[in-house]
Interface confidence: medium
């Protein structure tokens, strides 16, 4: 079999062999080598001699294989748009942002670029848990039976109603979606004397 | 040769101080990060900090924020790690360890051979 | 945090056979550009760390071809393909995909 072309390498019909590390190079007509994630090019390939990486420098980076001539500026999270950061920025990686507690992206373009405040669900109801926290507004749903939410809030959940009996109370009120079940101490015995029936 | 020498290690008492030093020889230590990584006897081991090539971003674990402090002088080819408010728990064999990259914080790929550091009343 | 689990804690080899280490992360290390955010140690007995392999699959400078890494977005295996005498020791496998970085519990490789 024949031997794997290794970069610089001639190629008439335009393509490289490994389409994420390698590229056309057109005024020569040949593939080149790509440079890793966390580099760029520092001298551009010629027929013979092979792209020169290097490292990008501190506060800059390149996510892919690449032939650009220039990292990328790591930017900070934007708190004034609600953003805090999860992971710094590295050569191969930019700054991995996410909505601050509390807050929703309500703009994305590749990423999140906005947050907003997440709306208040009312007594009664709670938050719809997601998937992804921070991904969406809330979307609000009735508590299930047997629980209750008292207040208006973004992150309130259903708590179940209390039981009474497990206080060794007896219930006064029941309850309901919106408010928990009210318990009183259990009546005195009636005395001896009031336990028949009366009559008039 | 590539060579990292810990020193500074010792017995303090919980609530104390101590200072470590790792000496870099046979690369050019402004254009790595550099990292701590510690060993609790008999346990696997714990990252404790890392610090970029230049000294300008440093990141921590959780059980060490606000206590311990990485810098580093390029001058001198040395990395620091200043410890305040020592807990037993801190009782550790602490290595010194390259970065592959200049701000990276992954691929350790060379390790010193670690200063012991023990604290104790 | 990342939390990085391996199996099994201890493992026993025959020299001359190949073994393989498992290593489970709660959320995955594959990076948006294709990269697994993941590196192996090897510590042998009495010394310090060394690398073993970095970014999921590629192998340090002066690591024999015997060692390979792989795995998706949660789940990595080492292989150690002919197990030699010096390759005894703690292997670990640490998350770089954020920090805190985490390192799994190690996997203690013997000799039968």
């Known amino acids: 079999s024949q031997p794997q072309a290794v970069p610089p390498y001639a190629s008439e019909n335009q393509t490289c062999r490994d389409q994420e590390k390698e590229y056309y190079e057109p005024q020569h007509r040949i593939c080149c080598s790509r440079c890793p994630p966390g580099t760029y090019v520092s001298a551009k390939c010629s027929r013979i001699r092979d792209t020169v990486c290097a490292t990008c420098a501190e506060n800059s980076y390149n996510e892919h294989w690449n032939y650009l001539t220039i990292c990328q500026l790591c930017r900070p999270c934007d708190p004034v748009m609600g953003l805090e950061e999860i992971a710094p920025c590295t050569s191969k990686r930019k700054t991995q942002c996410r909505c601050q507690p509390g807050m929703f992206c309500a703009a994305w373009a590749l990423e999140c670029t906005h947050c907003e405040l997440l709306s208040d669900c009312p007594p009664g109801t709670e938050a719809e848990l997601k998937d992804e926290v921070g991904k969406g507004n809330n979307h609000c749903v009735p508590c299930k039976a047997g629980h209750f939410q008292n207040t208006s809030s973004p992150s309130a959940r259903c708590q179940p109603h209390t039981r009474c009996e497990n206080q060794g109370l007896v219930e006064a009120a029941p309850g309901t979606a919106q408010s928990d079940t009210t318990c009183k101490n259990p009546l005195e015995p009636l005395p001896p004397e009031m336990s028949g029936t009366m009559l008039m | 040769e590539v060579q990292l020498l810990e020193s500074g290690g010792g017995l303090v008492q919980p609530g104390g101080s101590l200072r470590l030093s790792c000496a870099a020889s046979?690369?050019?230590?402004?254009?790595?990060?550099m990292s701590w990584v510690r060993q609790a006897p008999g346990k696997g081991l714990e990252w404790v900090s890392t610090?970029?090539?230049?000294?300008?971003?440093?990141y921590y674990a959780d059980s060490v924020k606000g206590r311990f402090t990485i810098s580093r002088d390029n001058s001198k080819n040395t990395l620091n790690l200043q410890m305040n408010s020592l807990r037993a728990e801190d009782t550790a064999v602490y290595y010194c360890?390259?970065?592959?990259?200049?701000?990276?914080?992954?691929?350790?790929?060379?390790w010193g051979q670690g200063t012991t550091v023990t604290v104790s009343s | 945090d990342i939390v990085m689990t391996q199996s099994p804690l201890s493992l026993p080899v025959t020299l001359g056979e190949s073994a393989s280490i498992s290593c489970r992360s709660s959320?995955?290390?594959?990076?948006?550009?294709?990269?697994?955010?993941l590196d192996w140690y090897l510590q042998k007995p009495g010394q310090s760390p060394q690398l073993l392999i970095y970014?999921?699959?590629n192998r340090a400078s002066g690591v024999p071809d015997r060692f390979s890494g792989s795995g998706s977005g949660t789940d990595f295996t080492l292989k150690i393909s002919r197990v030699e005498a010096e390759d005894v020791g703690v292997y670990y496998c640490m998350q770089t995909i954020q920090t805190p970085l985490t390192f799994g519990g190690g996997t203690k490789v013997e000799i039968k």
């Open positions: 610090i970029s090539g230049s000294g300008g971003s440093t």
């Open positions: 970014l999921g699959s």
């Open positions: 046979g690369f050019t230590f402004s254009s790595y990060a």
């Open positions: 959320q995955s290390l594959l990076y948006s550009s294709g990269y697994i955010d």
């Open positions: 360890a390259k970065v592959r990259d200049n701000w990276n914080y992954d691929g350790m790929d060379v």
